[in-house]
C-alpha cells in the first residue's frame, strides 16, 4: 500500500512507485522539489477514486507528464511547489 | 473470492438489440471502473468500452459507441451492455473485466464470457 | 487509435524452452502496457501490468519488458501448462487496443 504520511520530517513520501497510472485516473499531482527539509524531489499524485500515491521521479512516464506541465506553465513565473489538475 | 458472473447471452437476429449482464460479488463492485471486451470467432481480443464507478464517465471504442450503451446498477452490483443494430460481425464472446484503479491499472477479474450469436 | 502489432501469430515451442513475444505499439505508450494469457475456453489472465510488473499469483518465469513503442513478454522456461494466446494491451489512452494475440504451442 502506497501511503503518503504528513509527519515531523518534511519528506512526506515513504514509498515510491513506478508503476503507469492512466491520466483518466489521475485528479490532480503535486510536485515538491528537493529543499525544505527533505533532500529528494517527491511527486505526490492523486487519483479521482480519492487514494494518493508517491511516484518516483524517475518513472518515465510520469517524467513526461511533467514535462507537459512544465510547457503549459512556463508562461507563468516558476513557484517551489505546484499542483495542477490532469484534464 | 472475486466472482463476475455474466448473463444474458444468445441467439439474436440481424438489427435485433440484446442486453448482457455482469453481476459483481466479493468486491466493492461501486469504487471500480469496469469494462466489456469481446472476442470474435478467430480473431483478437477488442475492447468495447468502460464506465466509472458513478457512472459520470463511459468511454466508448469509437467503431461502436453508437450501437452499444454501457450501464451499472451499483445498488445491484451489476453491469450492463445494451446491444442495438446488431450484425453478423457482432457475433463473439463478450466478457466483462474490472479496471482495476488502485494498484495495477489495467484489467485484473474477468467474467466467464457469455456468447452472442448474430444469425437470422 | 493505437495499433498494437505483435510480429508472430504462432509460436512453437518445447518445455524448457525460453521464448520471448514481441508487441510493438504505433505510438509512444509510455510503460501502459499489460500482457494477457488466454487459455481455449477460459477467460484472459492478466500476467503483466506497467510493462513489466508481475500481476500478484503469477510465476516469475514470466517477465515483461520494454517501454514507449517496443515490448517484450518472456517465459523463461516453458512448462506444459504456458500453450495459450497471449496478448499485449495497452491501457495508456482511450480507446484501449489489444494486440491480435500469439498463440503458443508445443513442439
Known amino acids: 500500500v502506497l501511503e503518503v504520511y504528513y509527519t515531523h520530517l518534511r519528506c512526506r513520501c515513504v514509498q515510491e512507485s513506478s508503476v503507469f497510472i492512466p491520466r483518466r485516473f489521475i485528479d490532480r499531482i503535486q510536485i515538491s522539489p528537493r529543499g525544505n527539509g527533505c533532500p529528494r524531489k517527491e511527486i505526490i499524485v492523486w487519483k479521482k477514486n480519492k487514494s494518493v500515491v508517491c511516484v518516483d521521479p524517475q518513472a518515465e512516464w510520469i517524467q513526461r507528464i511533467m514535462e507537459m506541465l512544465r510547457k503549459k506553465s512556463s508562461s507563468t513565473p516558476p513557484v517551489p511547489v505546484f499542483k495542477r489538475k490532469i484534464p | 473470492e472475486v466472482k463476475l458472473l455474466q448473463s444474458g447471452g444468445g441467439l439474436v437476429q440481424p438489427g435485433g438489440s440484446l442486453k448482457l449482464s455482469c453481476a459483481a460479488s466479493?468486491?466493492?463492485?461501486?469504487?471500480?471502473?469496469m469494462s466489456w471486451v469481446r472476442r470474435a470467432p478467430g480473431k483478437g481480443l477488442e475492447w468495447i468500452g468502460e464506465?466509472?464507478?458513478?457512472?459520470?464517465?463511459?468511454n466508448y471504442a469509437p467503431s461502436l459507441k453508437d450501437k452499444f450503451i454501457i450501464s451499472r446498477d451499483n445498488a445491484k452490483n451489476t453491469l450492463y451492455l445494451q446491444m442495438s443494430k446488431v450484425r453478423s460481425e457482432d457475433t463473439a464472446l463478450y466478457y466483462c473485466?474490472?479496471?482495476?484503479?488502485?494498484?495495477?491499472?489495467?484489467?485484473?477479474?474477468w467474467g466467464q464470457g457469455t456468447s452472442v450469436t448474430v444469425s437470422s | 487509435d493505437i495499433v498494437m502489432t505483435q510480429s508472430h501469430k504462432f509460436m512453437s515451442t518445447s518445455v524448457g524452452d525460453r521464448v520471448s513475444i514481441t508487441c510493438k505499439a504505433s505510438?509512444?505508450?509510455?510503460?501502459?502496457v499489460a500482457w494477457y494469457q488466454q487459455k481455449p475456453g477460459q477467460s484472459p489472465k492478466l500476467l503483466i501490468y506497467?510493462?513489466?510488473y508481475r500481476y500478484t499469483g503469477v510465476p516469475d518465469r514470466f517477465t515483461g519488458s520494454g517501454s514507449r513503442t517496443d515490448f517484450t513478454f518472456t517465459i523463461s522456461s516453458v512448462q506444459t501448462e504456458d500453450p495459450a494466446v497471449y496478448y499485449c494491451?495497452?491501457?495508456?489512452?482511450?480507446?484501449?487496443?489489444f494486440g491480435a494475440g500469439t498463440e503458443l504451442e508445443l513442439k
Open positions: 473485466a474490472r479496471q482495476d484503479d488502485y494498484d495495477y491499472y489495467a484489467m485484473d477479474y
Open positions: 506497467s510493462a513489466s
Open positions: 505510438q509512444d505508450v509510455s510503460t501502459g
Open positions: 464506465i466509472n464507478p458513478d457512472s459520470s464517465t463511459i
Open positions: 494491451h495497452q491501457y495508456y489512452t482511450i480507446p484501449l487496443t
Open positions: 466479493g468486491i466493492d463492485f461501486s469504487r471500480y471502473w
